[in-house]
């Protein structure tokens, strides 16, 4: 299962941690994807390490753990964020976070 804070808020210009917690007795995590709406933000796997899309690379820092730290937030960053855990042999698990960026 995926456990996450469904709604989080942060101030414009500040930073926020996007975090999903995956727990399973049997499935192994093979890759984690982060998306902003439909746009791929970052991926992680042991074969690859962390990779962040170039359009976000100046503001998105991998971690902590399998989460992302989003910096220098703007009002345009308000919206839905999705984590996808690809696991073996358990399949795909998804989490959703709604980020509200508030004026400072």
């Amino acid at each position: 299962t995926i456990d996450t804070k469904r709604n989080i808020s942060a101030e414009e210009g500040g930073s926020v941690i996007l975090q999903c917690h995956f727990s399973s007795d049997t499935a192994e995590v093979t890759q984690v994807d982060w998306k902003q709406q439909d746009q791929l933000l970052a991926i992680y796997s042991v074969d690859l390490g962390w990779h962040v899309a170039s359009v976000f690379s100046d503001r998105v820092v991998p971690g902590p753990s399998l989460g992302l730290t989003f910096q220098s937030l703007t009002m345009n960053d308000t919206g839905e964020y999705f984590c996808t855990y690809h696991t073996y042999p358990g399949g795909i698990y998804k989490g959703r976070i709604f980020l509200k960026v508030q004026e400072s």
């Epitope: 994807d33 042991v46 074969d47 690859l48 690809h86 073996y88």
Partner: antibody
């Protein structure tokens, strides 16, 4: 059926650079990453680095950091590995290998290029 | 980096023999282990992923087992085409690392 076709053998002088190409024939890089692995004569396999073509970003083994650059051209489905400041110890066969992204990420390196022999000699 | 140690480094066996190769990780890697086969002058070939899952097209005489730090590749009945070098590879901690290889030779 995707095949990875690598460029031909190279002979290089110490201190120079080499650039090896790896073209995906019969497929694209859309859902894949490309790893680079080398094998010195009579030795084992050594992982060098990996690129995710959809991002154009690469990660490298600490040993090769600063000396290796991996790039990809999505339009031609070709990945490149450039190794600089060559020394005799870099004489090896260099392989590219495909990694799945997403749901099949657990597969590991399931398609390999035929290998490119790089000889470093003065 | 995680160190992968294979044993033996080489072995001699006959066609029809049961062959077992072991791979030990310097720390627990759960079941994040692959096995590859390499023949002289050829690229490696993926045999087993996730410690025990057989790659498509690989004969069922190959099997993998183990989790944590200790893993085994077994060839139930060695065939002439199986004489090769076998490598384990961990994919639990970045960067991925390989074992030193086990060469299976004809007795």
């Amino acid at each position: 059926q995707v095949q990875l076709v690598q460029s031909g053998a190279e002979v290089k002088k110490p201190g120079s650079s080499v650039k090896v190409s790896c073209k995906a024939s019969g497929g694209t890089f859309q859902n894949y990453a490309i790893s680079w692995v080398r094998q010195a004569p009579g030795q084992g396999l050594e992982w060098m680095g990996v690129i995710v073509p959809i991002f154009g970003t690469a990660n490298y083994a600490q040993k090769f950091q600063g000396r290796v650059t991996v790039t990809a051209d999505e339009s031609t489905s070709t990945a490149y590995m450039e190794l600089s400041s060559l020394r005799s110890e870099d004489t090896a066969v260099y392989y590219c290998a495909r990694l799945h992204l997403g749901q099949k990420a657990y597969y590991g390196m399931d398609v390999w290029g035929q290998g490119t022999t790089v000889t470093v000699s003065s | 980096d995680i160190q992968m140690t294979q044993s033996p480094s080489s072995l001699s066996a006959s066609v029809g023999d049961r062959v077992t190769i072991t791979c030990r990780a310097s720390q627990s890697i759960s079941s994040y282990l692959n096995w590859y086969q390499q023949k002289p002058g050829k690229a490696p070939k993926l045999l087993i992923y996730a410690a025990s899952s057989l790659q498509s097209g690989v004969p069922s005489r190959f099997s993998g087992s183990g989790s944590g730090t200790d893993f085994t590749l077994t060839i139930s009945s060695l065939q002439p085409e199986d004489f090769a070098t076998y490598y384990c590879q961990q994919r639990y901690v970045f960067p991925p690392t390989f074992g030193g290889g086990t060469k299976v030779e004809i007795k």
